[in-house]
């Protein structure tokens, strides 16, 4: 059962796993949620009645019954992990803590103009977990405006003390705000020879990479596959770090794979969700329960629904035994990974999907697209919305993209002459415009946020957000698209599509069925040559065929230029402007979304 509220002056007795330090009970709850075993916690707030050495302690707890006896204690705040909840979870913590010094290994000291600049520095430093900033009122002259970057083994402070005139906070890497490069490649036959900070068992290099990503100290990893010559090291995932943040030595070794933490791209790539099944593989661990199940899929469901289950092994039924049901072994371990992985015993293993909610919804695989043709099929572009105006009569105005459960990203030029959000309607999960009737449900628009530097589409900043009056419940036909990662600026996208109900030629009408066209990206230099009378800035991105023939057109404005990269769709562009439609040597010009990620996050994450 999901319990989100905090219990004041209450302490849970027993069940201690470990103690960490957090600046607030709210953050203690987040730490508990991300810990592989924590189900409940008790946090001690600062209080005159409490020993100062116990202030800010966050005791992580576990219980077979999922609850513990409650005891009254002043200054104690207790609660439950969000593991038991179905809602989306994020580790992003933008709070700034005044007069608190969060202790850790201080490895970098520099002058910063503000706490915000210090936080940005921490976010863009590969080692930084949190920071403390001495304000200009700090007593010690030389320390005023000093920004201390810190890290620890756990990613949380080793201690928190009161210190006047300082502020502390966490890195915003988990808020998708880091400018650090996002290196998704996995290097075969490679061993990174750097210091190991931890090791776990993993069924493949992808799971190893995801574990590295959410391990606070891991910057890169090496995985020994099941064919690795040394038997004791097979399926071993070595989590690594180095002072420079990069591997110092790469050794060529067959049957080993290496890669990097995906910390800087974790909002657009699944890192907690290990959804694959591993055939002829047994995961060993502490046994939680043995249940009969019809299939390995059913076994995974049982594991996902059992809050303490972390992974499972399913042994299929022998012939007609037990009504064709096999045995489903629900398991757990101290770190969420199997203690050993065995092959050749006929089992099918996998992980709980409970942690998938810690990943961005946009990373969920959508159904395979239909190749060829220009008309889309239902559920092919579930982030695409049609934006209607009701004044003077109802009609399709622009396209848009779902980027959050209350947010649509579109083009600013769509709102020329739109006096009020009251006349707007957002329809999601629509394939044909003819589906929209009087009684078709829609989302009202609470607010239109146009970029304050927008003047006209051709001069850039053609971007706007629509805040919806109600939240979107994600389904197969309506779900968000990932924003591109700031660390992905150098990625060359090769699988890009423009979609919309717009005109198919310059003098035409709005199409009934959502149209799609695969379009190659064009470099900004090339695009500039085609538009000599305009300034093509780095905040624009162009796409189109040299010979023309396929392009966005009137009515597609605001819609997505969607590019698939590493199995995840990214909103690379917003349909903005162009000379005519699908003309030879006149590519379409799109708002380059990666350049506006900060702006989008600032507006959508504003308290």
């Amino acid at each position: 059962e999901c319990v989100t509220q905090l219990l004041k002056d209450t302490c849970f007795e027993g069940g201690d796993i470990t103690t960490v330090f957090t600046p607030s009970a709210k953050y203690c709850q987040v730490v508990c949620t991300y810990h592989p075993r924590c189900l409940l916690f008790t946090f001690t707030a600062e209080s005159p009645s409490e020993d100062p050495t116990r202030w800010f302690t966050c005791v992580l707890k576990d219980s077979v019954t999922e609850t513990l006896p409650r005891v009254n204690r002043t200054a104690a705040i207790s609660g439950y992990s969000f593991k038991q909840c179905s809602h989306q979870i994020s580790a992003c913590n933008k709070d700034i803590y005044v007069d608190l010094d969060m202790k850790g290994i201080n490895y970098n000291s520099s002058v910063a103009k503000s706490a915000q600049e210090c936080q940005e520095r921490c976010t863009d430093d590969v080692h930084c977990h949190f920071f403390t900033y001495a304000t200009r009122q700090f007593p010690s002259l030389e320390h005023r405006n000093i920004c201390l970057l810190k890290h620890t083994q756990t990613g949380t402070p080793t201690r928190i003390t009161k210190l006047d005139k300082v502020v502390s906070g966490f890195s915003l890497k988990s808020c998708a705000l880091s400018n650090l490069a996002c290196i998704r490649d996995i290097f075969p036959n490679t061993v990174f020879a750097d210091s190991n900070i931890d090791s776990v068992m993993a069924p493949d290099a992808f799971v190893c990479g995801r574990i590295c990503t959410h391990h606070p100290g891991c910057l890169f990893f090496t995985f020994f596959s099941q064919e690795w010559p040394k038997e004791s090291q097979r399926n071993l995932c070595l989590l690594k770090t180095s002072e420079s943040g990069l591997p110092s030595t790469r050794i060529k070794k067959s049957k080993a794979l290496s890669g990097f933490s995906l910390q800087s791209c974790r909002h657009s790539i699944p890192v907690f969700c290990h959804s694959s099944f591993y055939h002829d593989t047994d995961f060993l661990g502490e046994e939680l329960d043995i249940v009969a199940a019809k299939s390995h899929e059913a076994c995974q469901k049982l594991c996902t629904n059992a809050v303490r289950c972390q992974f499972f092994t399913y042994t299929p039924a022998q012939a007609s035994c037990n009504e064709g049901k096999g045995k489903c072994y629900l398991k757990l371990s101290s770190n969420g990974s199997p203690t050993k992985i065995l092959h050749g015993r006929g089992g099918i293993s996998g992980y709980t999907l409970r942690l998938c909610k810690m990943d961005n919804e946009c990373t969920t695989k959508i159904k395979p697209r239909i190749v060829g043709g220009t008309a889309s099929v239902r559920g092919e572009w579930p982030w695409q919305v049609t934006l209607h105006t009701t004044s003077p009569t109802q009609r399709h105005l622009c396209g848009g993209s779902i980027i959050g459960n209350q947010w649509i990203l579109t083009a600013a030029h769509c709102f020329y002459g739109v006096e009020s959000p009251k006349i707007l309607r957002v329809y999601s999960g629509i394939l044909n415009q003819s589906e929209i009737k009087e009684d078709t449900s829609f989302f009202g628009v609470q607010e239109i946020i146009i970029h304050d530097q927008y003047k006209m589409a051709e001069s850039g900043y053609d971007i706007a957000l629509l805040k919806l009056e109600t939240t979107v419940n994600y389904t197969d036909s309506q779900r968000p698209i990932c924003l591109p990662s700031k660390g992905d600026r150098n990625v060359i996208y090769t699988d890009c599509w423009v979609t919309g109900w717009g005109y198919r030629k310059l003098r035409d009408k709005i199409q009934n069925t959502l149209q799609k066209a695969k379009i190659p990206l064009v470099t900004n230099e090339e695009c500039q040559k085609r538009y000599r009378g305009h300034k093509i800035t780095h905040k624009m991105i162009c796409a189109g065929y040299r010979e023309g023939g396929k392009d966005a057109c009137k009515g597609d404005s605001g819609g997505p230029l969607s590019c698939k990269h590493n199995e995840v769709w990214h909103l690379v562009g917003i349909t903005s402007w162009g000379e005519g439609c699908a003309q030879r040597e006149r590519p379409g010009v799109y708002t380059n979304v990666v350049e506006y990620v900060d702006w989008i996050l600032e507006k959508t994450q504003a308290v």
């Epitope: 010094d101 201080n106 490895y107 970098n108 000291s109 520099s110 002058v111 403390t132 001495a134 700090f138 007593p139 010690s140 002259l141 030389e142 320390h143 000093i146 201390l148 210190l163 300082v166």
Partner: antibody, heavy 124, light 107 residues
């Protein structure tokens, strides 16, 4: 042992420049600030400026602004103080002195380690 | 800039006696004050920081007090090696400034 070793005495003509070095040893060079203080013959101490060896940021006393430049070389753990457009009043002993430990926040400190001093004589 | 004024300019004291040196700031420097000792031909040596905290290796006969604008350095029982010039310095605002010094001489 924590030490600051300065370069030898200099004799300069008015209008010339002088560059004094201060080599640090026995501690993590980039973790502490470094000050320069001078003392004219028979006079008191006069603060000239500060450098943060980690990032190289500096702050100078108004009196020396435009004439003084403080730099550092982290590979040799050395700070330098260059004073240009020398005049006879610049004749003094120049000291480097270690300042605050910048990897911890604490309220109070002093210049706890000093170089042996470099005598600069400006004379035509 | 903050002006630091030390008094007296010269203090004549017999060995074993108590010496009290004063330092006044033109504006509050809170407790951001240090005291140094300098002997002829030598570099200054840190005695006290934070107005009252003795630096490492400094004998207990040296003590500092005061905050804001008025500060005192006390040497409880003067030893022969204590005869030197003493400087106060404020660390509260740029530029850092020193007092003119107090010379403690043998009476």
């Amino acid at each position: 042992e924590v030490q600051l070793v300065q370069s030898g005495a200099e004799v300069k003509k008015p209008g010339a420049s002088v560059k004094v070095s201060c080599k640090a040893s026995g501690y993590t060079f980039t973790s502490y600030s470094m000050h320069w203080v001078r003392q004219a013959p028979g006079q008191g101490l006069e603060w000239m400026g500060i450098i943060n060896p980690s990032g190289g940021s500096t702050s100078y006393a108004q009196k020396f602004q435009g004439r003084v430049t403080m730099t550092r070389d982290t590979s040799t753990s050395t700070v330098y103080m260059e004073l240009s457009s020398l005049r006879s009043e610049d004749t003094a002993v120049y000291y480097c002195a270690r300042g605050a430990y910048l990897l911890e926040l604490y309220y109070y400190y002093g210049m706890d380690v000093w170089g042996q001093g470099t005598t600069v004589t400006v004379s035509s | 800039e903050i002006v630091m004024t030390q008094s007296p300019a010269t203090l004549s004291v017999s060995p074993g006696e108590r010496a009290t040196l004063s330092c006044r700031a033109s504006q509050s420097v809170s407790s951001n004050l240090a005291w140094y000792q300098q002997k002829p031909g030598q570099a200054p040596r840190l005695l006290i920081y934070g107005a009252s905290t003795r630096a490492t290796g400094i004998p207990a006969r040296f003590s500092g007090s005061g905050s804001g604008t008025e500060f005192t350095l006390t040497i409880s029982s003067l030893q022969s090696e204590d005869f030197a010039v003493y400087y106060c310095q404020q660390f509260n605002d740029w530029p850092l400034t020193f007092g003119g010094g107090t010379k403690v001489e043998i009476k």
